[in-house]
């Protein structure tokens, strides 16, 4: 297993609709054809997997149907979008990239993107 540098923004504020997008960029040492991207969430020292996708270079990322993540790839960049976020989902979202094929296997883990999620203010009651 060889190490690889992964860069991602330090802080992102989700939209009022609970959507956060950020780029995860990896320094590929070779010509990988199969890449696996995993998003991990760290909050209060606990790490959980948010979503994961394996893709062939040049193809779209395919997450599971019920995943809250979508993404596109371009060269050594993966543009990740996480939706359905609530204020309680605020936390550090870490991008993990694995170059699966061809060998050698490379692993890179980013420093994480702190995603702040603000629940929208409830609308005041109005009379119709």
């Amino acid at each position: 297993c060889k190490a690889m540098h992964v860069a991602q923004p330090a802080v992102v504020l989700a939209s009022s609709r609970g959507i956060a997008s950020f780029v995860c960029e990896y320094a590929s040492p070779g010509k990988a054809t199969e890449v696996r991207v995993t998003v991990l969430r760290q909050a209060d020292s606990q790490v959980t997997e948010v979503c994961a996708a394996t893709y062939m270079m040049g193809n779209e990322l395919t997450f599971l149907d019920d995943s809250i993540c979508t993404g596109t790839s371009s060269g050594n960049q993966v543009n990740l979008t996480i939706q359905g976020l609530r204020a309680m989902d605020t936390g550090l979202y870490i991008c993990k990239v694995e170059l699966m094929y061809p060998p050698p296997y490379y692993l890179g883990i980013g420093n994480g993107t702190q995603i702040y999620v603000i629940d929208p203010e409830p609308c005041p009651d109005s009379d119709f």
């Epitope: 923004p9 330090a10 802080v11 992102v12 504020l13 989700a14 939209s15 009022s16 997008s21 950020f22 909050a43 209060d44 204020a87 605020t90 550090l92 994480g112 702190q114 702040y116 603000i118």
Partner: antibody, heavy 117, light 108 residues
């Protein structure tokens, strides 16, 4: 080193607007956010809101909603805070601060805005 | 809105003494998002502690933070002359990112 430098003091009349700038250096501007905090004379710190320089999304304190606008210019690594319909109780020192993963650091030197007729 | 209450309002101590400052939140939040700042007259606030207990870069180890849930503490083990200032706690886990009213540490 990481530094935030703010624009100079302003004197405004009630009802006018003010726009304070905060120029960042020493780090990747779009990787972080910028928060704005104000401090009235002899008072404590009041959080006004913040902007994510990565995507331009904003989160404002409810009491200022509709009067405040925070923006960034990523070509010059500068954040701006505009406050409209100024009142005498808006007289304060306005600070910008870099928003990190779980901290506000560093802070700008502050900009005194005086609202007086 | 999470309201932060700091006590005491003023703490009068001598250099070399231990200072214990309290910050209480109106509701429980993540301790990852509690910070302490020091402010001297005419200066901008300076980050001391983030994540309730992590010291910021360049902050002397006489400053320490602790606590979780709704109760947090900033401790200055031995007061130096330059430590006499106002100290604010802040939460930034829930919008709005509120500050406490501050505790003034002055020379007895």
């Amino acid at each position: 080193q990481v530094q935030l430098v703010q624009s100079g003091a302003e004197v405004k009349k009630p009802g006018a607007s003010v726009k304070v700038s905060c120029k960042a250096s020493g780090y990747t501007f779009t990787s972080y956010g910028i928060s704005w905090v104000r401090q009235a004379p002899g008072q404590g710190l009041e959080w006004m809101g913040w902007i994510s320089a990565y995507n331009g999304n904003t989160n404002y304190a409810q009491k200022l909603q509709g009067r405040v606008t925070m923006t960034t210019d990523t070509s010059t690594n500068t954040a701006y805070m505009e406050l409209r319909s100024l009142r005498s109780d808006d007289t304060a020192v306005y600070y910008c601060a870099r928003v990190g993963a779980n901290w506000f650091d560093p802070w700008g030197q502050g900009t005194l805005v005086t609202v007086s007729s | 809105e999470i309201v932060l209450t700091q006590s005491p309002g003023t703490l009068s101590l001598s250099p070399g003494e231990r200072a214990t400052l309290s910050c209480r939140a109106s509701q429980s939040g993540s301790s990852s998002y509690l910070a302490w700042y020091q402010q001297k007259p005419g200066q901008a606030p300076r980050l001391l502690i983030y994540g309730a207990s992590s010291r910021a870069t360049g902050i002397p180890d006489r400053f320490s933070g602790s606590g979780s849930g709704t109760d947090f503490t900033l401790t200055i083990s031995r007061l130096e002359p330059e430590d006499f200032a106002v100290y604010y706690c802040q939460q930034y886990g829930s919008s709005p990112f509120t500050f406490g009213p501050g505790t003034k540490v002055d020379i007895k």
